[in-house]
Interface confidence: low
C-alpha cells in the first residue's frame, strides 16, 4: 500500500517528498527516516532539516533537490540490496498533530552487469555522531503527528492509532507534496 | 500484537556483571529506535539511552556513559543492556521501551547485594 | 537537565470522583519546531508504564475519554473526570524535548 520506487545495486534511488514554503526562505523541519513514519518523528533518522539548513545527514543520503523551495526528496547514492524497505518523510509542521507523514516504498534489484567492486568506504563516516546541539539526537526523535491519506493511500505502521483527518491538498504524481500556509 | 520481552530477574554482587535482553515482536525491529530506562525503588525513572536500531548508534544520558553497554542483535530483534562492575546503586528494575516510548517491555529486576 | 514536579504526591479520590494533577517543569517544553513533548503515563503495581497522552493533549490509542491533558510551556494538568478502579496506580509526566529526557517523580491516584 506504500508508494513504490526502484533502484538498481551500485545507482542512486531517488525518493520524492515535497511541501510549498509558506514564503520564501519560510522553512519547516523536515525528517528521513528508514522504516515506517513511527509514533513519534522518525524512528530511524537519515537526514534532517531545521528552519534554515540540513542540520543532520549519514553517508550516501543527501537532498539534491532544492530544499529552500521545498524539495525535501531524498537522494541515496550507491543503493545495495540492504537500503532496500520504507522510508518516513516527515514535514514538522509546528502546533499540535499538524505532521505530514509519508512513507515512500524502496525497492533494490540486483544490477543487471555487476558493477566493478569500489574502495571500501571509512567506517567511521558511514557512522557520524548524533549532532548534540540542541535539538538534536532523539529529542527530535519523538513527534508524534498525523498520518494523512494521501490519494496513493500510504498507510505507516500505525495507521489505525494515528488516523488523521488532514489531508494534503497538493499531491504531485512523482510524489507527497504538501502545501505549507 | 506489538511486544516486548525482556528476560528475568537477575541476583549478582558487586563487580559482577548482568546482561539483560529485551525481544521485540509485532513489528519490524530496526524500523523503530530502543530505549532503556531505570527505575530504582523509590526514585524517579530516568531514561538511560537511545539506540538508532538501524545505524546502531547510541544517544546516552551523562548518568549511563562508561560502565554501561547497549548492543542490539537485528538478526533476532533484541536489544541488550550489560552493566559491568555492578554496584549496589544499580539495584533496580530495567525497562526497554521502543523508539517513542509507546510500548515498554515488563522490565528486569536486577538486584546487586554482596 | 530538565526537572519535572508533580504534585500532589498522593491523590485520594472516591470512585466516580474527577482527578487533576499537576506537573511542572524546570524549563519551557516548547520545542524549537513549535511543538511540546510532553507526556502522561499510568504505572500499576507490578507492571510497566503504559502511554496514556503524548504531547500535552492526545489521547493515545485506547485511552478512554475520560482522560484529557492540558497545559503550555512549564505547566500541565491530567485530569480523570470520572475515576474508575482500573484507573489506579502512579501517574507519571515525562518530556522529551530536551535531552536527556526526564520523568516526574510520580502521583499515586489510590481510593479514599
Known amino acids: 500500500s506504500e508508494v513504490e520506487y526502484r533502484a538498481e545495486v551500485g545507482q542512486n534511488a531517488y525518493l520524492p517528498c515535497f511541501y510549498t514554503p509558506a514564503a520564501p526562505g519560510n522553512l519547516v523541519p523536515v525528517c528521513w527516516g528508514k522504516g515506517a513514519c513511527p509514533v513519534f518523528e522518525c524512528g530511524n533518522v537519515v537526514l534532517r532539516t531545521d528552519e534554515r539548513d540540513v542540520n543532520y545527514w549519514t553517508s550516501r543520503y543527501w537532498l539534491n533537490g532544492d530544499f529552500r523551495k521545498g524539495d525535501v526528496s531524498l537522494t541515496i547514492e550507491n543503493v545495495t540490496l540492504a537500503d532496500s524497505g520504507i522510508y518516513c518523510c516527515r514535514i514538522q509542521i509546528p502546533g499540535i498533530m499538524n505532521d505530514e507523514k509519508f512513507n515512500l516504498k524502496l525497492v533494490i534489484k540486483p544490477a543487471k552487469v555487476t558493477p566493478a567492486p569500489t574502495r571500501q568506504r571509512d567506517f567511521t563516516a558511514a557512522f557520524p555522531r548524533m549532532l548534540t546541539t540542541r535539538g538534536h539526537g532523539p529529542a527530535e526523535t519523538q513527534t508524534l503527528g498525523s498520518l494523512p491519506d494521501i490519494n496513493l493511500t500510504q498507510i505507516s505502521t500505525l495507521a489505525n492509532e494515528l488516523r488523521d483527518s488532514r489531508l494534503a491538498n497538493d499531491l504531485r504524481d512523482s510524489g507527497a507534496t504538501i502545501r505549507i500556509g | 500484537q506489538i511486544q516486548l520481552v525482556q528476560s528475568g530477574p537477575e541476583l549478582k554482587k558487586p563487580g559482577e556483571t548482568v546482561k539483560i535482553s529485551c525481544k521485540a515482536s509485532g513489528y519490524t525491529f530496526t524500523n523503530y529506535g530502543m530505549n532503556w530506562v531505570k527505575q530504582a525503588p523509590g526514585k524517579v525513572l530516568k531514561w538511560m539511552v537511545w539506540i538508532n536500531t538501524y545505524t546502531g548508534e547510541p544517544t546516552y544520558a551523562d548518568d549511563f556513559k562508561g560502565r554501561f553497554a547497549f548492543s542490539l542483535e537485528t538478526s533476532a530483534s533484541t536489544a541488550y543492556l550489560q552493566i559491568n562492575n555492578l554496584k549496589n546503586e544499580d539495584t533496580a528494575t530495567y525497562f526497554c521501551?521502543?523508539?517513542?516510548?509507546?510500548?515498554w517491555g515488563q522490565g528486569t529486576s536486577v538486584t546487586v547485594s554482596s | 537537565d530538565v526537572v519535572m514536579t508533580q504534585t500532589p504526591l498522593s491523590l485520594p479520590v472516591s470512585l466516580g470522583d474527577q482527578a487533576s494533577i499537576s506537573c511542572r517543569s524546570s524549563q519551557s517544553l516548547v520545542h524549537s519546531n513549535g511543538n511540546t513533548y510532553l507526556h502522561w503515563y499510568l504505572q500499576k503495581p507490578g507492571q510497566s508504564p503504559k502511554l496514556l497522552i503524548y504531547?500535552?493533549?492526545n489521547r493515545f490509542s485506547g485511552v478512554p475519554d475520560r482522560f484529557s491533558g492540558s497545559g503550555s510551556g512549564t505547566d500541565f494538568t491530567l485530569k480523570i473526570s470520572r475515576v474508575e478502579a482500573e484507573d489506579l496506580g502512579v501517574y507519571f509526566c515525562s518530556q522529551n524535548t530536551h535531552v536527556p529526557w526526564t520523568f516526574g517523580g510520580g502521583t499515586k491516584l489510590e481510593i479514599k
Open positions: 521501551a521502543r523508539d517513542a516510548m509507546d510500548y
Open positions: 504531547k500535552v493533549s
